[in-house]
Protein backbone atom coordinates (compact mmCIF):
# COMPACT_ATOMS: atom_id res chain seq x y z
CA UNK A 1 0.00 0.00 0.00
CA UNK A 2 1.46 3.34 -0.96
CA UNK A 3 1.99 5.33 2.22
CA UNK A 4 1.24 9.05 2.37
CA UNK A 5 4.05 10.80 0.51
CA UNK A 6 6.45 12.81 2.65
CA UNK A 7 9.14 14.93 1.01
CA UNK A 8 12.26 16.32 2.66
CA UNK A 9 15.63 17.54 1.33
CA UNK A 10 18.32 14.93 0.78
CA UNK A 11 21.15 16.90 2.41
CA UNK A 12 21.47 19.81 4.84
CA UNK A 13 24.61 21.29 6.33
CA UNK A 14 24.31 22.50 9.91
CA UNK A 15 25.50 26.00 10.67
CA UNK A 16 28.71 26.62 12.61
CA UNK A 17 26.49 27.09 15.67
CA UNK A 18 25.09 23.57 15.32
CA UNK A 19 21.70 24.53 13.90
CA UNK A 20 20.09 22.71 10.99
CA UNK A 21 16.76 23.55 9.35
CA UNK A 22 14.75 21.69 6.75
CA UNK A 23 11.23 21.50 5.38
CA UNK A 24 9.09 18.38 5.69
CA UNK A 25 6.17 18.41 3.27
CA UNK A 26 3.38 15.85 3.13
CA UNK A 27 0.69 15.14 0.55
CA UNK A 28 -2.41 14.88 2.69
CA UNK A 29 -5.03 12.49 1.31
CA UNK A 30 -7.52 13.61 3.95
CA UNK A 31 -8.75 16.73 5.72
CA UNK A 32 -6.65 16.42 8.86
CA UNK A 33 -6.92 18.99 11.62
CA UNK A 34 -4.51 17.30 14.03
CA UNK A 35 -1.08 16.25 12.79
CA UNK A 36 1.80 14.57 14.58
CA UNK A 37 5.34 15.13 13.34
CA UNK A 38 8.23 13.01 14.61
CA UNK A 39 11.90 13.41 13.75
CA UNK A 40 13.87 10.15 13.85
CA UNK A 41 17.63 9.82 13.59
CA UNK A 42 19.06 6.79 11.85
CA UNK A 43 22.71 5.99 12.40
CA UNK A 44 24.02 2.58 11.39
CA UNK A 45 21.00 0.35 12.03
CA UNK A 46 19.86 2.24 15.12
CA UNK A 47 16.87 4.57 15.00
CA UNK A 48 16.18 6.99 17.82
CA UNK A 49 13.46 9.57 18.28
CA UNK A 50 14.89 13.08 18.28
CA UNK A 51 11.68 14.98 18.95
CA UNK A 52 7.95 14.93 18.30
CA UNK A 53 5.12 17.44 18.23
CA UNK A 54 1.39 17.31 17.68
CA UNK A 55 -0.24 20.39 16.25
CA UNK A 56 -3.60 21.61 15.08
CA UNK A 57 -3.65 22.83 11.50
CA UNK A 58 -3.04 26.57 11.45
CA UNK A 59 -1.39 26.55 14.88
CA UNK A 60 2.24 26.45 15.95
CA UNK A 61 4.07 23.22 16.63
CA UNK A 62 4.62 22.67 20.31
CA UNK A 63 7.61 20.56 21.25
CA UNK A 64 8.45 19.67 24.85
CA UNK A 65 10.30 22.39 26.76
CA UNK A 66 13.57 20.45 26.78
CA UNK A 67 13.35 19.52 23.08
CA UNK A 68 16.19 20.38 20.73
CA UNK A 69 13.60 20.97 17.99
CA UNK A 70 11.47 23.94 17.09
CA UNK A 71 9.15 24.31 14.16
CA UNK A 72 6.43 26.16 12.33
CA UNK A 73 3.71 24.86 10.04
CA UNK A 74 2.14 26.27 6.93
CA UNK A 75 -0.49 24.18 5.19
CA UNK A 76 1.04 20.78 4.46
CA UNK A 77 4.58 21.98 5.18
CA UNK A 78 6.46 21.83 8.44
CA UNK A 79 9.63 23.88 8.87
CA UNK A 80 11.82 22.05 11.36
CA UNK A 81 14.90 23.38 13.15
CA UNK A 82 17.20 21.19 15.20
CA UNK A 83 19.69 22.93 17.49
CA UNK A 84 22.65 21.98 19.63
CA UNK A 85 24.09 19.64 17.02
CA UNK A 86 27.67 18.45 17.15
CA UNK A 87 29.80 16.45 14.72
CA UNK A 88 28.81 13.22 16.44
CA UNK A 89 25.15 14.00 15.59
CA UNK A 90 25.80 13.74 11.85
CA UNK A 91 23.29 11.26 10.45
CA UNK A 92 20.07 10.66 8.57
CA UNK A 93 17.13 12.56 10.05
CA UNK A 94 13.78 11.10 9.01
CA UNK A 95 10.52 13.03 9.06
CA UNK A 96 7.50 10.95 10.04
CA UNK A 97 4.03 12.48 9.65
CA UNK A 98 0.80 11.07 11.06
CA UNK A 99 -2.66 12.48 10.39
CA UNK A 100 -4.29 11.84 13.74
CA UNK A 101 -7.70 13.51 13.53
CA UNK A 102 -10.28 13.29 12.17
CA UNK A 103 -10.17 9.74 10.85
CA UNK A 104 -8.98 8.15 8.69
CA UNK A 105 -5.49 7.78 10.11
CA UNK A 106 -2.61 8.17 7.66
CA UNK A 107 1.10 7.68 8.17
CA UNK A 108 3.98 8.77 5.95
CA UNK A 109 7.72 8.53 6.29
CA UNK A 110 10.23 10.61 4.38
CA UNK A 111 13.42 9.24 2.85
CA UNK A 112 15.46 11.21 5.35
CA UNK A 113 17.69 14.28 5.34
CA UNK A 114 21.39 13.66 5.80
CA UNK A 115 22.52 16.36 8.20
CA UNK A 116 26.24 17.04 8.27
CA UNK A 117 27.57 18.74 11.37
CA UNK A 118 31.12 20.04 11.51
CA UNK A 119 32.39 21.18 14.89
CA UNK A 120 33.90 24.67 14.61
CA UNK A 121 37.67 24.93 15.01
CA UNK A 122 38.56 26.37 18.41
CA UNK A 123 39.75 29.92 18.17
CA UNK A 124 43.54 30.15 18.45
CA UNK A 125 44.83 31.84 21.58
CA UNK A 126 45.70 35.47 20.98
CA UNK A 127 48.92 36.90 22.33
CA UNK A 128 48.79 40.60 23.02
Amino acid sequence: CKAMHVAQPAVVLASSRGIASFVCEYASPGKATEVRVTVLRQADSQVTEVCAATYMMGNELTFLDDSICTGTSSGNQVNLTIQGLRAMDTGLYICKVELMYPPPYYLGIGNGTQIYVIDPEPCPDSDF
Epitope: C1, A3, M4, P29, G30, K31, T38, L40, Q42, S45, V47, I94, K96, E98, L99, P103, P104, Y105, Y106, L107, I109
Partner: antibody, heavy 116, light 106 residues
Framework: QVQLVQSGAEVKKPGASVKVSCKAS????????IHWVRQAPGQGLEWIGY????????DYNQKFKSRATLTVDNSISTAYMELSRLRSDDTAVYYC?????????WGQGTLVTVSS | DIQMTQSPSSLSASVGDRVTITCGAS??????LNWYQRKPGKAPKLLIY???NLADGVPSRFSGSGSGRDYTLTISSLQPEDFATYFC????????FGGGTKVEIK
Protein backbone atom coordinates in the same frame (compact mmCIF):
# COMPACT_ATOMS: atom_id res chain seq x y z
CA GLN B 1 -23.52 3.61 12.57
CA VAL B 2 -20.81 2.51 10.17
CA GLN B 3 -21.59 -0.72 8.33
CA LEU B 4 -19.96 -2.65 5.51
CA VAL B 5 -22.24 -5.35 4.15
CA GLN B 6 -20.78 -7.91 1.78
CA SER B 7 -22.42 -10.17 -0.79
CA GLY B 8 -23.10 -13.82 -0.03
CA ALA B 9 -20.97 -16.94 -0.30
CA GLU B 10 -19.88 -18.12 -3.74
CA VAL B 11 -18.83 -21.49 -5.15
CA LYS B 12 -16.74 -21.31 -8.31
CA LYS B 13 -14.89 -23.69 -10.60
CA PRO B 14 -11.14 -23.34 -11.22
CA GLY B 15 -10.45 -20.84 -13.98
CA ALA B 16 -13.66 -18.88 -13.35
CA SER B 17 -13.98 -15.37 -11.91
CA VAL B 18 -15.76 -14.11 -8.82
CA LYS B 19 -17.00 -10.60 -8.00
CA VAL B 20 -17.64 -9.72 -4.36
CA SER B 21 -19.49 -6.54 -3.39
CA CYS B 22 -19.21 -4.39 -0.27
CA LYS B 23 -21.96 -1.84 0.45
CA ALA B 24 -21.00 0.94 2.85
CA SER B 25 -23.31 3.04 5.01
CA UNK B 26 -23.11 5.35 8.01
CA UNK B 27 -20.24 7.53 6.74
CA UNK B 28 -19.14 9.53 3.70
CA UNK B 29 -18.04 6.80 1.31
CA UNK B 30 -15.48 8.92 -0.55
CA UNK B 31 -13.60 9.91 2.63
CA UNK B 32 -12.05 6.46 3.21
CA UNK B 33 -10.18 3.90 1.18
CA ILE B 34 -11.74 0.46 0.85
CA HIS B 35 -9.25 -2.33 1.46
CA TRP B 36 -9.64 -5.99 0.60
CA VAL B 37 -8.11 -8.72 2.74
CA ARG B 38 -8.50 -12.48 2.62
CA GLN B 39 -7.96 -15.38 4.97
CA ALA B 40 -7.59 -18.90 3.59
CA PRO B 41 -8.38 -21.88 5.84
CA GLY B 42 -5.64 -22.32 8.42
CA GLN B 43 -3.71 -19.35 7.01
CA GLY B 44 -3.05 -15.79 8.14
CA LEU B 45 -4.53 -12.58 6.80
CA GLU B 46 -3.39 -11.42 3.36
CA TRP B 47 -3.83 -7.89 2.01
CA ILE B 48 -5.08 -7.80 -1.60
CA GLY B 49 -5.21 -4.05 -2.22
CA TYR B 50 -7.27 -0.91 -1.82
CA UNK B 51 -9.28 1.54 -3.86
CA UNK B 52 -9.87 5.18 -2.91
CA UNK B 53 -13.44 6.09 -3.95
CA UNK B 54 -12.68 9.83 -3.90
CA UNK B 55 -10.17 9.61 -6.76
CA UNK B 56 -10.63 6.09 -8.06
CA UNK B 57 -6.93 5.43 -7.45
CA UNK B 58 -5.93 1.96 -6.33
CA ASP B 59 -2.94 -0.05 -5.23
CA TYR B 60 -2.45 -3.80 -5.18
CA ASN B 61 -0.34 -6.41 -3.51
CA GLN B 62 1.97 -7.49 -6.34
CA LYS B 63 0.82 -11.07 -5.80
CA PHE B 64 -2.72 -10.17 -6.92
CA LYS B 65 -2.02 -7.40 -9.42
CA SER B 66 -2.62 -9.52 -12.52
CA ARG B 67 -5.81 -11.19 -11.24
CA ALA B 68 -7.61 -8.76 -8.93
CA THR B 69 -9.62 -5.75 -10.07
CA LEU B 70 -10.99 -3.26 -7.54
CA THR B 71 -13.78 -0.90 -8.55
CA VAL B 72 -16.34 1.35 -6.88
CA ASP B 73 -19.75 2.78 -7.67
CA ASN B 74 -19.91 5.98 -5.63
CA SER B 75 -23.57 6.52 -6.47
CA ILE B 76 -24.53 3.49 -4.39
CA SER B 77 -21.54 3.57 -1.97
CA THR B 78 -20.43 0.13 -3.07
CA ALA B 79 -16.99 -1.35 -3.69
CA TYR B 80 -16.25 -4.47 -5.71
CA MET B 81 -13.41 -6.95 -5.81
CA GLU B 82 -13.16 -9.24 -8.82
CA LEU B 83 -10.68 -12.10 -8.82
CA SER B 84 -10.10 -13.94 -12.07
CA ARG B 85 -8.49 -17.26 -13.08
CA LEU B 86 -9.49 -18.78 -9.77
CA ARG B 87 -7.47 -21.65 -8.31
CA SER B 88 -8.26 -23.99 -5.44
CA ASP B 89 -5.89 -22.06 -3.17
CA ASP B 90 -8.06 -18.95 -3.64
CA THR B 91 -10.61 -20.62 -1.37
CA ALA B 92 -10.85 -18.12 1.48
CA VAL B 93 -12.98 -15.63 3.35
CA TYR B 94 -12.69 -12.26 1.62
CA TYR B 95 -13.16 -9.09 3.67
CA CYS B 96 -13.62 -5.48 2.74
CA UNK B 97 -12.58 -2.88 5.29
CA UNK B 98 -12.57 0.88 5.36
CA UNK B 99 -9.59 2.94 6.40
CA UNK B 100 -6.66 5.09 5.64
CA UNK B 101 -3.61 3.32 7.02
CA UNK B 102 -5.62 1.45 9.64
CA UNK B 103 -8.74 -0.58 8.93
CA UNK B 104 -11.25 0.50 11.54
CA UNK B 105 -14.43 -1.17 10.23
CA TRP B 106 -14.72 -4.48 8.41
CA GLY B 107 -17.39 -6.29 6.46
CA GLN B 108 -18.69 -9.63 7.72
CA GLY B 109 -16.67 -11.56 5.14
CA THR B 110 -17.60 -13.52 2.03
CA LEU B 111 -16.63 -17.16 1.72
CA VAL B 112 -15.41 -18.01 -1.77
CA THR B 113 -14.96 -21.72 -2.42
CA VAL B 114 -13.08 -22.83 -5.52
CA SER B 115 -13.74 -26.46 -6.33
CA SER B 116 -14.08 -28.62 -9.40
CA ASP C 1 7.94 -7.62 1.16
CA ILE C 2 8.48 -6.98 4.85
CA GLN C 3 7.97 -10.16 6.88
CA MET C 4 6.18 -9.99 10.22
CA THR C 5 7.01 -12.65 12.82
CA GLN C 6 4.61 -12.91 15.71
CA SER C 7 5.24 -14.78 18.93
CA PRO C 8 4.05 -16.83 20.59
CA SER C 9 1.71 -18.49 18.10
CA SER C 10 -0.53 -19.43 21.02
CA LEU C 11 -0.64 -18.96 24.77
CA SER C 12 -2.79 -20.03 27.69
CA ALA C 13 -3.69 -17.48 30.32
CA SER C 14 -6.19 -16.83 33.09
CA VAL C 15 -8.55 -13.94 33.65
CA GLY C 16 -6.61 -11.13 35.32
CA ASP C 17 -3.26 -12.15 33.83
CA ARG C 18 -0.97 -9.69 32.11
CA VAL C 19 -0.43 -10.87 28.53
CA THR C 20 2.31 -9.75 26.16
CA ILE C 21 2.43 -10.54 22.44
CA THR C 22 5.40 -9.56 20.31
CA CYS C 23 5.79 -8.84 16.64
CA GLY C 24 9.10 -8.51 14.83
CA ALA C 25 9.57 -6.98 11.39
CA SER C 26 12.25 -8.10 8.95
CA UNK C 27 13.34 -4.46 8.67
CA UNK C 28 12.76 -1.13 10.39
CA UNK C 29 9.13 -0.06 9.98
CA UNK C 30 9.34 3.18 12.00
CA UNK C 31 6.24 2.52 14.07
CA UNK C 32 4.07 1.78 11.03
CA LEU C 33 2.23 -1.05 12.75
CA ASN C 34 -1.35 -1.90 13.69
CA TRP C 35 -2.83 -4.58 15.96
CA TYR C 36 -6.15 -6.39 15.40
CA GLN C 37 -8.27 -8.79 17.42
CA ARG C 38 -10.23 -11.56 15.74
CA LYS C 39 -12.86 -13.84 17.27
CA PRO C 40 -14.13 -16.99 15.52
CA GLY C 41 -16.73 -16.21 12.89
CA LYS C 42 -16.27 -12.46 13.33
CA ALA C 43 -14.44 -9.81 11.36
CA PRO C 44 -11.16 -8.45 12.77
CA LYS C 45 -11.33 -5.44 15.07
CA LEU C 46 -8.75 -2.65 15.14
CA LEU C 47 -7.11 -2.28 18.55
CA ILE C 48 -3.97 -0.19 18.08
CA TYR C 49 -2.79 1.94 15.16
CA UNK C 50 0.58 3.56 14.55
CA UNK C 51 2.17 1.19 17.12
CA UNK C 52 0.90 3.06 20.19
CA ASN C 53 -2.46 4.72 19.54
CA LEU C 54 -5.58 3.15 21.05
CA ALA C 55 -8.45 2.85 18.56
CA ASP C 56 -11.85 4.31 19.43
CA GLY C 57 -13.88 2.20 21.83
CA VAL C 58 -11.00 -0.10 22.77
CA PRO C 59 -10.53 -0.61 26.53
CA SER C 60 -7.46 1.00 28.10
CA ARG C 61 -6.16 -2.39 29.28
CA PHE C 62 -4.83 -2.77 25.73
CA SER C 63 -1.63 -0.92 24.91
CA GLY C 64 0.97 -0.97 22.18
CA SER C 65 4.65 -0.15 22.32
CA GLY C 66 7.84 -0.58 20.36
CA SER C 67 9.90 1.01 17.61
CA GLY C 68 12.28 0.00 14.86
CA ARG C 69 11.74 -3.69 14.20
CA ASP C 70 10.24 -4.84 17.52
CA TYR C 71 6.70 -4.23 18.76
CA THR C 72 4.54 -5.40 21.65
CA LEU C 73 0.83 -5.63 22.39
CA THR C 74 0.06 -5.80 26.10
CA ILE C 75 -3.21 -6.67 27.81
CA SER C 76 -2.75 -5.47 31.38
CA SER C 77 -5.49 -7.59 32.93
CA LEU C 78 -7.03 -10.24 30.71
CA GLN C 79 -10.84 -10.27 30.61
CA PRO C 80 -13.14 -13.13 29.50
CA GLU C 81 -13.95 -11.31 26.24
CA ASP C 82 -10.24 -11.01 25.36
CA PHE C 83 -9.81 -14.70 24.48
CA ALA C 84 -9.26 -14.37 20.75
CA THR C 85 -6.57 -14.32 18.08
CA TYR C 86 -4.40 -11.21 17.71
CA PHE C 87 -2.64 -10.06 14.54
CA CYS C 88 -0.03 -7.40 13.92
CA UNK C 89 0.09 -5.60 10.58
CA UNK C 90 2.87 -3.69 8.87
CA UNK C 91 1.64 -0.66 6.91
CA UNK C 92 4.81 0.22 5.01
CA UNK C 93 5.15 -0.88 1.40
CA UNK C 94 3.01 -3.95 0.74
CA UNK C 95 0.89 -4.43 3.83
CA UNK C 96 1.68 -7.71 5.58
CA PHE C 97 0.29 -9.43 8.66
CA GLY C 98 1.86 -11.51 11.38
CA GLY C 99 0.81 -15.14 11.67
CA GLY C 100 -1.41 -14.47 14.67
CA THR C 101 -1.36 -15.29 18.37
CA LYS C 102 -4.23 -17.33 19.80
CA VAL C 103 -4.97 -16.46 23.42
CA GLU C 104 -6.72 -19.40 25.10
CA ILE C 105 -8.15 -20.03 28.55
CA LYS C 106 -5.78 -21.84 30.89
Amino acid sequence: QVQLVQSGAEVKKPGASVKVSCKASGYTFTDYKIHWVRQAPGQGLEWIGYIYPYSGSSDYNQKFKSRATLTVDNSISTAYMELSRLRSDDTAVYYCARGGDAMDYWGQGTLVTVSS
Amino acid sequence: DIQMTQSPSSLSASVGDRVTITCGASENIYGALNWYQRKPGKAPKLLIYGATNLADGVPSRFSGSGSGRDYTLTISSLQPEDFATYFCQNILGTWTFGGGTKVEIK
